[in-house]
Amino acid sequence: ACNTATCVTHRLAGLLSRSGGMVKSNFVPTNVGSKAF
């Protein structure tokens, strides 16, 4: 797991998984208009 100051800060903010990898933003959509429907 990542224990650098940056990783600790990000983990507290909920941006990192326990393994230290970035967590995906759980499908908060970006660029919606580039996708058809």
């Epitope: 499908f27 908060v28 959509p29 580039s34 996708k35 058809a36 429907f37």
Partner: antibody, heavy 115, light 108 residues
Framework: EVQLQQSGPELVKPGASVKMSCKAS????????MHWVKQKPGQGLEWIGY????????KYNEKFKGKATLTSDKSSSTAYMELSSLTSEDSAVYYC????????WGQGTTLTVSS | EIVLTQSPTTMAASPGEKITITCSAS???????LHWYQQKPGFSPKVLIY???NLASGVPARFSGSGSGTSYSLTIGTMEAEDVATYYC?????????FGSGTKLEIK
């Protein structure tokens, strides 16, 4: 298999409100936005807006602000659209459509506004 | 808002004929924001082409799309009876998203 099942036809009086539903199945409901589209009889398509079920964020066509309200219920994987202060101009088929390039649309809900 | 003007409004074609429908935007848009839909009578629309030139899943290869800026087109390489429908372009570049007024394709 992805499916969007919309609620049945509605016949309502002018001035009333109506809330129609779009039940999603076959995919993770919070993984795509849900669009709503209006089609008057014999006419073209008009985008109303979309809702992001993950965080209930919405974007509206300015024309439909104050007319349409989009909501969703994650527990039942259902998107809703409420239309208020109905007039004959609101008589149309309303479609929900899953955002993405895979082309999933509901079958449409027919709304008739008549006294 | 971005206005999409389709041409022609209606057309009739013979089986086997090549068809081209155009979509002109009132402002320049990136091709990733331009999509095409097909709507058969009594049915919901379905996406044919997304991002100007990408064929949607299950769509026959006789359909193709191209264009950039303010000028886009949908082509049917060889018209078939099952292609009778109304075709719409749609832009997702700016809100409100808008559709073209539609091109009704009939068979001779």
């Amino acid at each position: 298999e992805v499916q969007l099942q919309q609620s049945g036809p509605e016949l309502v009086k002018p001035g009333a409100s109506v809330k129609m539903s779009c039940k999603a199945s076959g995919y993770t409901f919070t993984s795509s936005v849900m669009h709503w589209v209006k089609q008057k009889p014999g006419q073209g398509l008009e985008w109303i807006g979309y809702i992001n079920p993950y965080n209930d964020g919405t974007k509206y066509n300015e024309k439909f602000k104050g007319k349409a309200t989009l909501t969703s219920d994650k527990s039942s994987s259902t998107a809703y659209m409420e239309l208020s202060s109905l007039t004959s101009e609101d008589s149309a088929v309303y479609y929900c459509a899953k955002g993405g390039n895979d082309g999933y649309w509901g079958q449409g809900t027919t709304l008739t506004v008549s006294s | 808002e971005i206005v999409l003007t389709q041409s022609p409004t209606t057309m009739a074609a013979s089986p086997g004929e090549k068809i081209t429908i155009t979509c002109s935007a009132s402002s320049s848009i990136s091709s990733i924001y331009l999509h095409w839909y097909q709507q058969k009578p009594g049915f919901s629309p379905k996406v044919l082409i997304y991002r100007a030139s990408n064929l949607a899943s299950g769509v026959p290869a006789r359909f193709s799309g191209s264009g950039s800026g303010t000028s886009y087109s949908l082509t049917i390489g060889t018209m078939e009876a099952e292609d009778v429908a109304t075709y719409y372009c749609q832009q997702g570049s700016t809100i409100p998203f808008t559709f073209g007024s539609g091109t009704k394709l009939e068979i001779k």
